[in-house]
């Protein structure tokens, strides 16, 4: 699996952001597809679970992302994106997107470095 992300994303505190992750695979996409999103905080703390998808989306039941994340992917479009709501400054860090599409299960994990800022500084802001 090859993963494509925006790598760097800047978004304003309190807004929502789409963490875009798309992929390609030598295998046709089917029900075996899984997507795992995790978060590495800027301070180097432990990696945290953000989201999991396998046929259905699985929201986190607890933790910082509870009730603040939703699936915005579409397997037919080779899209594994999520929406992160009500951004906070402590959401700063690296988000990883891992896609497995058996038998195609290898490949580099996609990364997005999210910077949550006070105001828009340039046109790299990616809304909804």
């Amino acid at each position: 699996v090859e993963i494509y992300t925006s790598r760097v994303l800047e978004a304003v505190n309190g807004t929502d952001a789409r963490l875009k992750c798309t992929f390609s695979s030598f295998a046709p996409v089917g029900d075996a597809l899984t997507v795992t999103w995790n978060f590495r905080p800027l301070d180097g703390g432990p990696e945290q679970f953000v989201f999991y998808y396998h046929i259905d989306p699985f929201q986190p039941m607890s933790g910082r992302f509870k009730d603040r994340v939703s699936w915005d992917g579409n397997p037919e479009r080779y899209d594994a994106s999520i929406l992160l709501w009500k951004l906070q400054f402590d959401d700063n860090g690296t988000y990883t997107c891992q896609v497995k599409n058996p038998p195609d299960v290898d490949g580099v994990i996609g990364e997005i470095r999210l910077s949550v800022v006070h105001t828009v500084r340039f046109s790299e802001i990616h809304f909804l």
Epitope: S6, D16, K20, T22, Y53, I55, D56, P57, Q59, D67, V69, S70, W71, D72, N74, E76, R77, L83, W85, S123, I125, H126, F127, L128
Partner: antibody, heavy 114, light 107 residues
């Protein structure tokens, strides 16, 4: 086969209300964000509303914000659009669409006129 | 709102011709652009997503390209059944916006 069937359109007076429905089949409805898009009589396309999976966070353009409400019932595989304080400029064909527009229904016509 | 300026508005071509439609965004939209085909009396149908990816079942005569603000949609060899209106759309930034459409007519 993905199928989206809209209903609920009709003729309504300015200031009136209408509720549109979209029955979805052929895919796992709860796993997809959903949208409403309208097409004016001049054939211009306008995005009207968007609802996420899960808790169903909603988004609207300023033209309909505060007047239109998108909602979903995953148990019934149905998407809704509640429209109130309707204006003549809301006259259009209303389509529901899966995700960011990969499949569209056949549309339901809304006419706002006295 | 991001404005999507689509040109031309009308195209009159012969079967077998190559057709190009362009869409210019008023600010960068990355590659978050889709192209739709709407045949008379029908709803829009997705042809291209993420600027260059052909959707399921779309013939390979339809192609898209571009990044940032400038996008192009091409039909390499027009066929009679391609008579339709074609729209571009950006979904990079809310509110999502569409181009004004290009009506393709066959001589």
């Amino acid at each position: 086969e993905v199928k989206l069937v809209e209903s609920g359109g009709g003729l309504v007076q300015p200031g009136g209300s209408l509720k549109l429905s979209c029955a979805a089949s052929g895919f796992t409805f709860s796993s997809y964000t959903m949208s409403w898009v309208r097409q004016t009589p001049e054939k211009r396309l306008e995005w009207v509303a968007y609802i996420t999976t899960g808790a169903g966070r909603t988004y609207y353009p300023d033209t309909v914000k505060g007047r239109f409400t998108i909602s979903r019932d995953n148990a019934k595989n149905t998407l809704y659009l509640q429209m109130s304080s309707l204006k003549s400029e809301d006259t259009a064909m209303y389509y529901c669409a899966r995700h960011r527009g990969d499949y569209w229904g056949q549309g339901t016509s809304v006419t706002v006129s006295s | 709102s991001i404005v999507m300026t689509q040109t031309p508005k009308f195209l009159l071509v012969s079967a077998g011709d190559r057709v190009t439609i362009t869409c210019k965004a008023s600010q960068s939209v990355s590659n978050d652009v889709a192209w739709y085909q709407q045949k008379p009396g029908q709803s829009p149908k997705l042809l291209i997503y993420y600027a260059s990816n052909r959707f399921t079942g779309v013939p390979d005569r339809f192609t898209g390209s571009g990044y940032g603000t400038d996008f192009t949609f091409t039909i390499s060899t027009v066929q009679a059944e391609d008579l339709a209106v074609y729209f571009c759309q950006q979904d990079y930034s809310s509110p999502w916006t569409f181009g004004g459409g290009t009506k393709l007519e066959i001589k």
